[in-house]
Interface confidence: low
């Protein structure tokens, strides 16, 4: 047992930088997926920076599966947004496929193979849960 | 930065129960996977349990590539072995696929899709590094 | 590009066992969403049984329940689809069909939304006595 | 009997147009789930003609469409032609069925 000291991420979590991440084992929904990572005291991922990016495309190189992450729009006529509602900055990363498509439920936002895809979020992927590292001696 | 406390696990390694585990982001042949895990001071997976198999198996479900693993032999008349020298617990998994061929360079086994099969160790693939976890304060 | 190819046809007694196999090819199985759907002669589409993205994982409809068994072999990525206890009103052809996106990227559980686009070419089972 | 209908046979002219109906409830087609049609030519499997209630897989001219709305889906066909004589079936997911359904089919007759 770790005395007198807290983990950076707790098990099962990769730490990196100044964040957790963990890669869910069960596929779901994208809001299910929200709920998922708030029940951990996550977020959803956010990528703020093509460094984020760059590690999280090494991390999910042996995966063909898409993964949820917290980018999502109403419809086509609203702007990309995280769930802290900050917009997506325009040179991160283009985002392919489904972009002008309205859907019910939202448009949400998945990385596959190092690229970020746009499509119905009702649909069900592996999502990426984000947090900040514990990084002070407790 | 952690204060008067050593992390359990190294960036970007997955810290679980006693041990720390590294999925590689590149694909080599058995020995230079070895080599690899070896340089970050660190052996080819052990699983020692089923719990230990539960996990990897969990932590590679998004995944449909094969991860070597740190268990060979020289050929079908040897037994299969450990990094360490220890024998397999024919308990905890089957291994399935070329088990009864002989290849020059030995005969691997890797974990795909849940399941071990035994490969000539000059195939490349994926591999999965482990090391102890550094349980205590410092 | 995803291809499904089916074992042959078979020629049963009733109160015997089939087992259909389909071979996926150009994607492994665990990437797809594999389903089972018959058609007796002169009749429409009948689906047995499949992947269920509710709960990810296979569903047998209740007609089928006790009767149909769906494996998969991951290391040969074929599925199997066996039924027992035949009867005649079992003649069919039997489909392996399954989904690959609108990226063509087989994902598990997308069928949902995108459909079937990819049928095996059938096998007929014929139950006689 | 299906959990969806659809009628038994529509005909048509070449040139005119043509709909087929697939009726299903609150548990399939009503719940949000999306409606599939299917092309069967004799002799052949069948063909994904309409995904998602009204997209088309690249291949398939724009003659067909699909629409939804509310336990209802329907197809249309538009500028019949002889090559379009098929059955045509439709395809939901049912919740309380725990899976796929599909309706009994159309048998379209070019005139």
């Known amino acids: 047992r770790v005395a007198n000291c807290s983990a950076p991420c707790p098990q099962d979590w990769i730490w990196h930088e100044e964040n957790c991440y963990l890669f869910s084992t069960g596929s779901f929904n994208w809001e299910k997926s929200q709920e998922k990572c708030l029940s951990l005291d996550a977020k959803l991922l956010k990528i703020n920076s093509t460094a984020d990016l760059d590690f999280i495309q090494q991390a999910i190189s042996y995966s063909s599966f898409p993964f949820w992450m917290g980018l999502s729009r109403r419809n086509p006529s609203y702007p990309w947004l995280w769930e802290d509602g900050s917009p997506l900055m325009p040179h991160l990363f283009r985002i392919r496929g489904a972009v002008s498509q309205t859907y019910p439920s939202g448009t949400c936002a998945y990385i596959q193979r190092g690229a970020v895809y746009a499509e119905n979020c009702i649909l069900a992927a592996f999502s990426i849960c984000q947090k900040k590292a514990n990084l002070r001696a407790q | 930065r952690v204060a008067n406390c050593s992390a359990p696990c190294p960036q970007d390694w997955i810290w679980h129960e006693e041990n720390c585990y590294l999925f590689s982001t590149g694909s080599f042949n058995w020995e230079k996977s070895q080599e690899k895990c070896l340089s970050l001071d660190a052996k080819l997976l052990k699983i020692n349990s089923t719990a230990d198999l539960d996990f990897i198996q969990q932590a590679i479900s998004y995944s449909s590539f094969p991860f070597w693993m740190g268990l060979s032999r020289r050929n079908p008349s040897y037994p299969w072995l450990w990094e360490d020298g220890s024998p397999l617990m024919p308990h905890l998994f089957r291994i399935r696929g070329a088990v009864s061929q002989t290849y020059p360079s030995g005969t691997c086994a890797y974990i795909q899709r849940g399941a071990v099969y035994a490969e000539n160790c000059i195939l490349a693939a994926f591999s999965i590094c482990q090391k102890k976890a550094n349980l205590r304060a410092q | 590009q995803v291809q499904l190819v089916q074992s042959g046809a078979e020629v049963k007694k009733p109160g015997a066992s089939v087992k259909v196999s389909c071979k996926v090819s150009?994607?492994?199985?665990?990437?797809?969403?594999m389903h089972w759907v018959r058609q007796a002669p002169g009749k429409g589409l009948e689906w047995m049984g499949g992947?269920?993205?509710?709960?990810?994982?296979?569903h047998v409809s209740q007609k089928f329940q006790g009767r149909v068994t769906m494996t998969e072999d991951t290391s040969t990525d074929t599925a199997y689809m066996e039924l027992s206890s035949l009867r005649s009103e079992d003649t069919a052809v039997y489909y392996c069909?399954?989904?690959?996106?609108?990226?063509?990227?087989?994902?598990?559980?997308?069928?949902?939304?995108?459909?079937?686009?990819?049928w095996g070419q059938g096998t007929t089972v014929t139950v006689s006595s | 009997q299906s959990v969806v209908t659809q009628p038994p046979s529509v005909s048509g002219a070449p040139g005119q147009r043509v709909t087929i109906s697939c009726t299903g409830s609150?548990?399939?087609?009503?719940?949000?789930?999306?409606v599939h049609w299917y092309q069967q030519l004799p002799g052949t499997a069948p063909k994904l003609l309409i995904y998602g209630n009204s997209n088309r897989p690249s291949g398939v001219p724009d003659r067909f469409s699909g629409s939804k709305s509310g336990t209802s889906a329907s197809l249309a066909i538009t500028g019949l032609q002889a090559e379009d004589e098929a059955d045509y079936y439709c395809?939901?997911?049912?919740?309380?069925?725990?899976?796929?359904?599909f309706g009994g089919g159309t048998k379209l007759t070019v005139l």
């Open positions: 992947f269920d993205p509710e709960d990810w994982s296979n």
């Open positions: 150009g994607y492994t199985l665990t990437e797809l969403s």
């Open positions: 395809q939901s997911y049912d919740s309380s069925l725990s899976g796929w359904v």
């Open positions: 609150s548990s399939n087609i009503g719940a949000g789930y999306d």
């Open positions: 069909l399954t989904s690959t996106g609108r990226q063509g990227k087989g994902v598990r559980g997308w069928d949902y939304y995108y459909g079937m686009d990819v």
